[in-house]
């Protein structure tokens, strides 16, 4: 069976795909589609797919999508909130996505794989 | 979209204090490093004080050192600004914005006006 990745190729490999998004991004991302914004510090995976998770037919995160699925350690389905302390703010997706590369990049740097 | 709204300025007396307050919207605050920058009449921008994105760590152009102190609120998405012991030569528009070295994450507010005068 093939080894597992390690934490830090799949992290990289999640900005490399974040990346990808924004700079291929020609027509407004998943229709300008709006998530829930989110205040948190940690458990950020986790938090980033229950937002980003509500984003149906929308193919160009659908990568995305399954790959923070990979981190967030628990069951994530649409509706979800948990780690949403505030859900009385929404966002478009392609500044969900632009934040979510900046703050990965920063986390990279720090080495916080996980 | 991306906005920052900056509050608090106002004519203060030499000696005085005043709090600065960024309300940010639009994008994720929590995620980003925050700081003020400031321009004095007739003069260029000057960079007054930075926080990393978990307030851990501040930072301080030495004309402001020991008198001012940055701080944030991740769950109120507010950047603050205590000004102590202002002086005249404080005396500046206050621009609240993002302090990312990555290219397209410049962010700034529209400035508060802090008048130090007797």
């Known amino acids: 069976s093939p080894s597992p990745v390690p934490p830090s190729t799949a992290l990289k490999e999640l900005i490399e795909e974040l990346v990808n998004i924004t700079q291929n991004q020609k027509a407004p991302l998943c229709n300008g589609s709006m998530v829930w914004s989110i205040n948190l510090t940690a458990g950020v995976y986790c938090a980033a797919l229950e937002s980003l998770i509500n984003v149906s037919g929308c193919s160009a995160i659908e990568k995305t999508q399954r790959m923070l699925n990979g981190f967030c350690p628990h069951k994530v389905s649409a509706g979800q909130f948990s780690s949403l302390r505030v859900r009385d703010t929404k966002i478009e997706v392609a500044q969900f996505v632009k934040d979510l590369l900046v703050h990965l990049k920063k986390l990279f740097r720090e080495g916080q794989f996980n | 979209g991306v906005q920052l709204l900056e509050s608090g300025g106002g004519l203060v007396q030499p000696g005085g204090s005043l709090r600065l307050s960024c309300a940010a919207s639009?994008?994720?605050?929590?995620?980003?490093?925050m700081g003020w920058v400031r321009q004095a009449p007739g003069k260029g921008l000057e960079w007054v004080s930075s926080?990393?994105?978990?307030?851990?760590?501040?930072y301080y152009a030495d004309s402001v050192k020991g008198r001012f102190t940055i701080s944030r609120d991740n769950s109120k998405n507010t950047l603050y600004l205590q000004m102590n012991s202002l002086r005249a030569e404080d005396t500046a528009v206050y621009y609240c914005?993002?302090?990312?070295?990555?290219?397209?994450?410049?962010?700034w507010g529209q400035g508060t006006l802090v008048t130090v005068s007797s």
């Open positions: 914005a993002t302090a990312e070295d990555e290219p397209g994450y410049d962010y």
């Open positions: 639009g994008f994720i605050f929590a995620w980003y490093d």
């Open positions: 926080i990393d994105w978990k307030g851990g760590k501040t």
